[in-house]
């Protein structure tokens, strides 16, 4: 669950469950820098437009970001 | 599985201090913001304060901004509750409750302690 | 400030169907997802629906949960009405998030 930006990290939970791709908007990764010193990984979901927040170190989540940058880079001429 | 006990409570006069703790297993405490919520005798629920997982947000009701501390020991898988300058009106039960992994609602409640703020 | 309504109390036979309202004030209900706790006399309160009408394992299917934007509310509707149905049902919403709101609670009586 994501805040805005002006507050230093910007989850108030992380979940090592990976999300549905059908269901995702937009998936954000957030680097470290001197605001929050953890990368951050957002999941926008297309329904109400929720953001949840995904553990970087789970490897479920890992997985999730290969097979989204794997459907992003057969997209891309 | 998954449990939340919360302690600390007692009878405290006003403008004196507490502070409630609530010790949590079975899930993966380092990764799970948690809510303190109350509730007044015979009344209903009332949100508190809110922390995130690894302690660096903290957001709190109005009505305890300033005289309430929210904040976590990932270590002891604790999460505590600093109450100060403490009123008639905080009087109630409170309750830890875990949001779930996934989502936006609490999925796991303590059984609640009691503070009775009463001169 | 976002704020929910109910009403304060509700009665119904076993076997009947219930209707609870929450109803928003100061934003739009819709905006965010809405979520129901149920809570027994001297007990904690549990899930019985969130993410306005996704019902938790465990949760029997004669729960649902319902979003209405032209009212702007949230109805938590209970069908074939057993006594242990008995308890006070709060909704929950934010205002906005991380910031929490609850209902004021609406106490149900099986007659």
């Known amino acids: 669950v994501p805040l805005s930006r002006t507050v230093r990290c910007t989850c108030i939970s992380i979940s090592n469950q990976p999300v549905n791709p059908r269901s995702l908007e937009k998936l954000e990764i957030i680097p470290a820098s001197q605001f929050c010193p953890r990368v951050e990984i957002i999941a926008t979901m297309k329904k109400k437009g929720e953001k949840r927040c995904l553990n970087p170190e789970s490897k479920a989540i890992k997985n999730l970001l290969k097979a989204v940058s794997k459907e992003r880079s057969k997209r891309s001429p | 599985q998954v449990q939340l006990v919360e302690s600390g409570g007692g009878v405290v006069q006003p403008g004196r201090s507490l502070r409630l703790s609530c010790a949590a297993s079975?899930?993966?405490?380092?990764?799970?913001?948690i809510h303190w919520v109350r509730q007044a005798p015979g009344k209903g629920l009332e949100w508190v304060a809110v922390i995130s997982y690894d302690g660096s947000n903290k957001f709190y009701a109005d009505s305890v901004k300033g005289r309430f501390t929210i904040s976590r020991d990932n270590s002891k898988n604790t999460l505590y509750l600093q109450m100060n300058s403490l009123r008639a009106e905080d009087t109630a039960v409170y309750y830890c409750?875990?949001?779930?992994?996934?989502?936006?609602?609490?999925?796991?409640w303590g059984q609640g302690t009691l503070v009775t703020v009463s001169s | 400030n976002f704020m929910l309504t109910q009403p304060h109390s509700v009665s119904e036979s076993p076997g009947k169907t219930v209707t609870i309202s929450c109803t928003g004030s100061g934003g739009s209900i819709d905006r965010n997802y809405v979520q129901w706790y149920q809570q027994r006399p001297g007990s904690s309160p549990t899930t019985v629906i969130y993410?306005?009408?996704?019902?938790p394992s465990g949760v029997p299917d004669r729960f649902s949960g319902s979003i209405d934007s032209s009212s702007n509310s949230a109805s938590l509707t209970i069908s074939g009405l057993k006594t242990e149905d008995e308890a006070d049902y709060y909704c929950q919403s934010y205002d906005p998030l991380p910031v929490w709101v609850f209902g004021g609670g609406t106490k149900l009586t099986v007659l």
């Open positions: 079975g899930f993966t405490f380092s990764n799970s913001g």
């Open positions: 993410e306005d009408n996704q019902r």
């Open positions: 409750a875990k949001l779930r992994d996934n989502g936006e609602y609490l999925d796991y």
